[in-house]
């Protein structure tokens, strides 16, 4: 947030930008974590908006027996490779058709041994707090389906009657990589030295990185008529003074009527 400054006091303000704020000629430009005229206030919520989708990549190897390996298959721009890629992609699209998270396959390498196909199976799901479970389940179904097809679609009498045939023993899952998204970790990192006081709370399955100074959450600190302010020692209530009352206490819940105090003092005089 920024506050524009007009008049003679502006130069003084320029040299007083705090917490890494920079003067742009009119106002203090504050870093993400701060706001206020001098960047003196700590924000109460940090945007850690999750990605819309989370991806996973499975590195698989299958052995295709219905195609004989030729040197041209090593060249990804050759007609041979392009045709193989088309057939293999169509075959895998059929194999994985029941998996909503399935996006496609990407061949990384073809090598000798009938045709050994090193490839990635790409998965994607909408972000929810349960995305890990969703993708873990999808990877298990991928394993089941590829194992099944490579067991069933095999050469008989040296001829394949399917779109592609496989060597049952040539199917291997080398590695599974899931895009890591850890809102708690992101929240802690972005809150920097205030990280101990910021927490992640979910609303409509969306994570919010908030301090107790952000109203409307279960961890929110109720300062009553006071103002919640974050400091390095945690959130604190800054209590206000009205025309009639002083407020005090940890949550500014103790009100003292000024007239009673003044009356008491006059009594002593």
């Amino acid at each position: 947030r920024t506050t524009t400054c007009f008049g003679d006091g502006c130069q003084n303000t320029a040299s007083r930008c705090k917490n890494g704020g920079t003067w742009d000629g009119l106002k203090c430009q504050c870093p993400n974590l701060y706001y206020g005229e001098l960047c003196e206030e700590v924000v109460s919520s940090i945007d850690i908006g999750p990605p819309e989708t989370i991806s996973a990549q499975m590195e698989l190897t299958v052995t295709v027996t219905s195609v004989k390996f030729t040197e041209e298959l090593k060249n990804h721009s050759s007609q041979e490779f392009q045709e193989f890629k088309q057939t293999f992609t169509e075959q895998m699209n059929i194999v994985y058709s029941g998996i909503p998270e399935y996006v496609g396959v990407n061949i990384t390498k073809l090598r000798l041994g009938s045709v050994v196909v090193e490839h990635d199976v790409l998965l994607r799901t909408k972000y929810t707090p349960e995305y890990k479970t969703v993708l873990d389940n999808a990877t298990e179904v991928v394993k089941e389906k590829i194992t099944k097809v490579t067991t069933q679609q095999i050469m008989i009498n040296d001829i394949c009657s399917d779109m592609m045939c496989f060597n049952t023993t040539g199917t291997q899952v080398q590695n599974i990589t899931v895009t890591q998204y850890d809102p708690e970790e992101d929240c802690r990192k972005m809150a920097k030295e205030y990280g101990d006081y910021f927490v992640v709370e979910y609303r409509d399955q969306k994570p919010y990185c908030i301090s107790p100074c952000e109203p409307g959450f279960s961890v929110s600190k109720n300062c009553n008529l006071g103002k919640c302010q974050m400091s390095l020692s945690g959130p604190q209530c800054l209590c206000v003074t009205t025309e009639t009352h002083w407020y005090s206490g940890e949550t500014c819940n103790q009100g003292t009527q000024k007239s009673l105090v003044y009356g008491h003092h006059h009594h002593h005089h």
Epitope: E83, I159, C160
Partner: nanobody, 123 residues
């Protein structure tokens, strides 16, 4: 684009012979594979025979010993010699080609197709 054109079909009596030809527009498939498929009325297209650039040939069980596939790379041509023809051989015959050295007689494995030629076996 690669062009394939099948010819040589016709009416033949049971037990008779016929030779089908398939002309390719160039020799693109001389290092890959070529094949014959057929489709009888109301039925799915099925593989008949396949020949690869390494000299390998394969046949559907229903035609083994009766049909012979061959090719002439100099003429960019594929042939199917059909002997001892039966009524159940009646179908439209298609030639197909691939850049790959294939061992598959499933139409989904083949990307390049020619126009069909009709073979009718009837007395």
């Amino acid at each position: 684009d690669v062009q394939l054109q099948a010819s040589g079909g016709g009416l033949v009596q049971p037990g008779g012979s016929l030779r089908l030809s398939c002309a390719a527009s160039d020799n693109t498939f001389s290092r890959g594979s070529m094949s014959w498929f057929r489709q009888a009325p109301g039925k799915e297209r099925e593989g008949v025979a396949i020949i690869s650039s390494d000299g390998w040939t394969g046949y559907a069980d229903s035609v083994k010993g009766r049909f012979t596939i061959s090719q002439d790379n100099a003429k960019n041509s594929l042939y199917l010699q059909m002997n001892s023809l039966r009524a159940e051989d009646t179908a439209v015959y298609y030639c197909a080609a691939s850049f790959l050295v294939l061992r598959a007689l499933n139409p989904k494995a083949w990307h390049y197709w020619g126009q069909g030629t009709m073979v009718t076996v009837s007395s």
